[in-house]
């Protein structure tokens, strides 16, 4: 799990002739807001398909009124980032659509009117956890400058947010098949992804794909308090007699999408899939013509001279989609061998090879351990096109150069003191406890430094010790 973050830096006239008219005027003051839509980049989806990775809407920007006779400047922007949370793995390659919307603040009947000013789209490769990436996109005579990044939400780490770093389950080592998390040698890397949507507060998992509930919570995603789990109706008003917590109407109830658009629920709200010729949050924007510059990436717009006739975008080589907003994915043929990463640079394909492989298509297998030294008595282990060091006791990291602190994971229970030792660690137990890690109270119902059974707990109840 993690968050995709988008920072809009500027929106204004692009370079070159034909500066656009200001979208606002003294008669019609307006303000801008932005919408971002994300889709997994390797899926061959139409431009109108739902935002499978998520979508977000910015706040409204400051009100702007054009100064008479002045060229359209960069327009005032909303504050803050646009954040799109994603629940599962970050796909690495993604498609985006960023829409700039104008909200007119005149005296129209029925409140403010919205209209789409510009729409840019693209496809990018991005690793989670990396630095901000800067971008410039043009739509007609407008230019949008922005930065974006993807970051993982703890405890997820890695370029796809699929690795989890958790405190060690066992005191002295990671479980079978689990490695220490570099550089956090006191934590274990677990290839553990709980069921999508599993409550981070009330659920946990010990095996991938499961969602186990902490005491007092139930339901498939551990989101229902135990006292409220006897509800039968899937949706409807709350029942005073049963105390059921029942969700209210769904975001798609009554279909908020206009002009024949179809509605699909998203984790945060809803998404409208619009028929051709309609756009906007609720498919309320119509009458797009070639004058609006709807074809991206150098596409040629044909037809659509008046709002009642559809336009067609003739796309240049390498692009497709009804608005030429999608780059043709030549990487879908998987030309890179041995797990190499395919990069479509537009003018050429490039393969980024995994460690241990080389060649234009990563076709050459190298000796993984050749020239690789493991420090501090570690031994090199070949396999899977990457070398790995099996480190001597007390050392960790990729090349065994990091000294592991055996006490960092608080391996001594019940207030025991941990001491690093040349052979590992030693626990000095608090009075009344024993065991290699002080995990066993000697007399659990007697007086001891930390009582093992606080009053009111029955056998079988969990008790917490720090």
């Amino acid at each position: 799990a993690g968050v995709f973050e988008l920072q809009i830096h500027s929106f204004g006239p692009g370079p070159g002739p034909g500066a656009p008219r200001s979208p606002c005027s003294a008669r019609l003051p307006c303000r801008l807001f932005f919408r971002v839509c994300l889709k997994p980049g390797l899926s061959e989806e139409a431009a109108e398909s739902p935002c499978a990775l998520g979508a977000a809407l910015s706040a409204r920007g400051p009100v702007y009124t054009e100064q008479p006779g002045a060229p359209a400047p960069d327009l005032p922007l909303p504050d803050g980032l646009l954040q799109v949370p994603f629940r599962d793995a970050w796909p690495g390659t993604f498609s985006f659509i960023i829409e700039t919307w104008r909200e007119e603040l005149g005296d129209q009947i029925g409140g403010p009117a919205w209209s789409l000013l510009a729409r840019v789209a693209g496809r990018r490769r991005l690793a989670a956890g990396g630095p901000w990436a800067r971008d410039i996109q043009r739509a007609g005579a407008w230019e949008l400058r922005f930065s974006y990044r993807a970051r993982c939400e703890p405890p997820a780490v890695g370029t796809a947010c699929t690795r989890l770093c958790r405190p060690r389950s066992a005191p002295s080592r990671c479980g079978p098949g689990l490695r220490p998390c570099a550089p956090l040698e006191d934590e274990c890397e677990a290839p553990l992804v709980c069921r999508a949507g599993c409550s981070p507060e009330h659920g946990f998992c010990e095996q991938p794909g499961e969602c186990r509930c902490l005491e007092g919570w139930t339901g498939p995603l551990c989101t229902v308090p135990v006292s409220t789990s006897s509800c039968l109706s899937p949706r409807g008003p709350s029942s005073a007699t049963t105390g059921c917590l029942v969700p209210g109407p769904g975001p798609c109830d009554g279909n908020p999408c206009a002009n024949g658009g179809s509605c699909s629920e998203t984790p945060r709200s809803f998404e409208c899939t619009c028929p051709r010729g309609f756009y906007g949050l609720r498919c309320e924007v119509s009458g797009v013509t070639c004058a609006d510059g709807p074809c991206f990436n150098g596409g040629l717009c044909v037809g659509g001279a008046d709002p009642d006739s559809a336009y067609i975008c003739h796309c240049p080589p390498g692009f497709q989609g009804s608005n030429c907003e999608k780059r043709v994915d030549r990487c879908s043929l998987q030309p890179c061998r041995n797990g190499g990463l395919c990069l479509d640079l537009g003018h050429a394909l490039r393969c980024r090879c995994r460690a241990g492989f080389a060649g234009p298509r990563c076709e050459h297998d190298l000796d993984d351990c050749a020239g690789r030294a493991c420090a501090n008595g570690g031994t090199c282990v070949e396999g899977g096109g990457a070398h790995r060091c099996s480190c001597a006791l007390g050392f960790g990291g990729r090349d065994c150069r990091e000294r592991a602190d055996p006490c960092a994971a608080r391996p001594c229970a019940h207030g025991g003191r941990c001491y690093a030792h040349f052979s590992g660690l030693v626990c000095a137990c608090a009075p009344g406890y024993m065991g290699a890690r002080c995990e066993f109270p000697v007399h659990p119902d007697g007086a001891s430094a930390l009582p093992a059974a606080p009053p009111g707990l029955r056998p079988g109840d969990p008790q917490r010790y720090l």
Partner: nanobody, 117 residues
Framework: EVQLVESGGGLVQPGGSLTLSCAAS????????MAWYRQAPGKKRELVAG???????MYIDSVKGRFTISRDNAKNSVYLQMNSLRAEDTAVYYC???????????WGQGTLVTVSS
């Protein structure tokens, strides 16, 4: 939540043998430190034997050489093999678990062992 269910208790003559079982659910026993405790009538509950998450074992002096604690990861269970039983071993035997991920302790409901001729 970890749940522990003991079984195997009963009546046995002095010098006899008995094996207690503790079946765990809600977590893998390989990730738990587990122990057997006993409580004789009118006495405090006391630790008998323990097995840490890393597999190391420990015993109180009065049972060393007679009792053996073991773990079967496949069956998600912990056992206490009791040989050369004595009358003073008569007690309710409880299974105990310490879960390292949450630092919570759990108890079973107990099983009665009576050593009598």
């Amino acid at each position: 939540e970890v749940q522990l269910v003991e079984s195997g208790g009963g009546l046995v003559q002095p010098g006899g043998s008995l094996t207690l079982s503790c079946a765990a659910s809600g977590s893998r026993v390989s990730f738990l430190s587990m122990a057997w405790y006993r409580q004789a009538p009118g006495k405090k509950r006391e630790l008998v034997a323990g097995i840490s998450a890393d597999g190391s074992t420990m015993y109180i002096d009065s049972v060393k050489g007679r009792f053996t604690i073991s773990r079967d990861n496949a069956k998600n269970s912990v056992y206490l093999q009791m040989n050369s039983l004595r009358a003073e071993d008569t007690a309710v035997y409880y299974c105990y678990a310490y879960r390292w991920t949450t630092r919570l302790t759990y108890w079973g409901q107990g099983t009665l062992v009576t050593v009598s001729s």
